[in-house]
Amino acid sequence: LKGQEFAPSHQQVYAPLRADGDKPRAHLTVVRQTPTQHLKNQFPALHWEHELGLAFTKNRMNYTNKFLLIPESGDYFVYSQVTFRGMTSECSEIRQAGRPNKPDSITVVITKVTDSYPEPTQLLMGTKSVCEVGSNWFQPIYLGAMFSLQEGDKLMVNVSDISLVDYTKEDKTFFGAFLL
Amino acid sequence: LKGQEFAPSHQQVYAPLRADGDKPRAHLTVVRQTPTQHLKNQFPALHWEHELGLAFTKNRMNYTNKFLLIPESGDYFVYSQVTFRGMTSECSEIRQAGRPNKPDSITVVITKVTDSYPEPTQLLMGTKSVCEVGSNWFQPIYLGAMFSLQEGDKLMVNVSDISLVDYTKEDKTFFGAFLL
Amino acid sequence: LKGQEFAPSHQQVYAPLRADGDKPRAHLTVVRQTPTQHLKNQFPALHWEHELGLAFTKNRMNYTNKFLLIPESGDYFVYSQVTFRGMTSECSEIRQAGRPNKPDSITVVITKVTDSYPEPTQLLMGTKSVCEVGSNWFQPIYLGAMFSLQEGDKLMVNVSDISLVDYTKEDKTFFGAFLL
């Protein structure tokens, strides 16, 4: 009974205490993207820096081939920011000419892939119409939430247009997850 | 071996169990900013409320002179939102007159200062072009991510134009960090 | 003294160790909103999905009648994203006609209600002027921060215009909280 003395009365037997510093964690940062083939009907996935600068993976959380691999089941906080940068498309002219059309947009999706399940699951989506008056525009989309993930799940970040992603600084575009 | 019985098999000796309520944490809220001198080539830092209303610091996480002081090494989740409020500048007219120029912008940076290291490190940046058609505009920039910080590190929030920060409500502009 | 051996030297007696998997947590996702009566001087509250798809509540964190109920006192990370979708209002025309007026806006507030306290407390606010040139527009507002909450507190998400909330996908509009 000794080790039990700090455990609250509703302590579950199957949920052992564990050191926080020992939990799977990762923070990945942007690199310059190269165009790659991606699945039809799915936005392209970003690839990431996982060890230089601010980036790290630890405690069995691994990064491979655009995916973060979930090493143990549990509730994770998952987040990403993507900074987009572009030039004004015809969007504003079309509108000023009085022909409202589908707006240009930028979208970020954090996607979960489970090998035993055929379809990826979209966990988080940030989507924004872009119809800027100015010539150059730039803006971030931030996402973050908690999800129950299973050992073996894989997480990736997809974007609507990979060529608009600002890859210039590690603090502008990033992706991370940590076990709660 | 008694105290070990709830520890998972991959428990590190150097990572002791610890009570969650005992971890360094802070949530700081906005106050009206006064113009101050700041370092050349660095955006000015915001100062903050640290004890009134929703604001607090606890468990040796201290706030002093615009900085949050990190009291122990570990992985921290760090976040901030800054709401900006402004009036339309000539930006939109310049563009409408067909002279595309560098856009006006608003930027938030969460910066880490390590005394032993000469240059501050930008942990997070949110930057957005502003070229509004309307007269008054307002909008938030939110940032949040996990970083490995060392005891003695100092965190601050820098903004591109301190006179545009919405200081009116503690829920609009804030800054926080907590040890995971 | 056996069970104490992993506890750091600043361990508080009143803060027992507890299993992380045992902490109150919830992630709620959007459903189609139905117009309901709401308090004067308060934005309408959203109601949520709490068990289907990505949504869950666990460890005594319950959802009832638009509120997340806080089952135990402590520091919680609370977050929400609301994606808004609309058509251009007269806003841009008013401005183009040279009559600058108060811009249209979209606002999200995470509110705490304490039964023993007459007034709700606004924990987080994201507010943005909307004056789009294009016809259709859509954009998210994301919020997240840490707060000290008491057992019995209730959390809700209020929005400035419930009819503009994008209810189409669970990854676009969501609300969550977890005990740290």
Partner: antibody, heavy 116, light 107 residues
Framework: EIQLVESGGGLIQPGGSLRISCAVS????????VDWVRQAPGKGLEWLGV???????NYNSALKSRLTISKDNSKNTVYLQMNSLRAEDTAVYYC??????????WGQGTLVTVSS | DIQMTQSPSSLSASVGDRVTITCRAS??????LNWYQQKPGKAVKLLIY???RLHSGVPSRFSGSGSGTDYTLTISSLQPEDFATYFC?????????FGQGTKLEIK
Amino acid sequence: EIQLVESGGGLIQPGGSLRISCAVSGFSLSSYGVDWVRQAPGKGLEWLGVIWGFGGTNYNSALKSRLTISKDNSKNTVYLQMNSLRAEDTAVYYCASGNFDAMDYWGQGTLVTVSS
Amino acid sequence: DIQMTQSPSSLSASVGDRVTITCRASQDISNYLNWYQQKPGKAVKLLIYYTSRLHSGVPSRFSGSGSGTDYTLTISSLQPEDFATYFCQQGNTLPFTFGQGTKLEIK
């Protein structure tokens, strides 16, 4: 200590131009806005315009065609240029700095007299 | 432009008196209402911003209140150094506009 000091006032002929300077110390112009306000003799205060930290400007629409506000961040100085002066432009001209909604710190002002 | 109407235009009072000055905006200014004090030969001073918040260094005898279009500056107990001209200013919409001023004189 925050200080704003205006200079460049004096007697100007009708139809002429003025260029007033506002030298600031204690803060950086690259990150704070500076407003210009004037006060005709025995009258109230009239807001003329602002230059924001990022360089954008706003003007009082009644005077916009005659006003230009500029700055030199390296000299920590803001300038107000006004053309086609008339007698009713006679006033004390102030620069002030603050947040987006209010002017926290003011200079002492410089008197501009438009007369032949 | 938003018109700011200040009243009274002048006011005589004695040391120790409680004094109230009002300011009315021609449209809702969302609490972005500021009060300034002006003395001859001195720089203008910001007293109160965002309706009711005291600027740093301003004595607590000064207070502000109001919402929507109607706002008030109150000096709870006049001191000799308070005799001056007071202006209100809206900071909600450009162009910023001022009231015409209230001259507070010794009775």
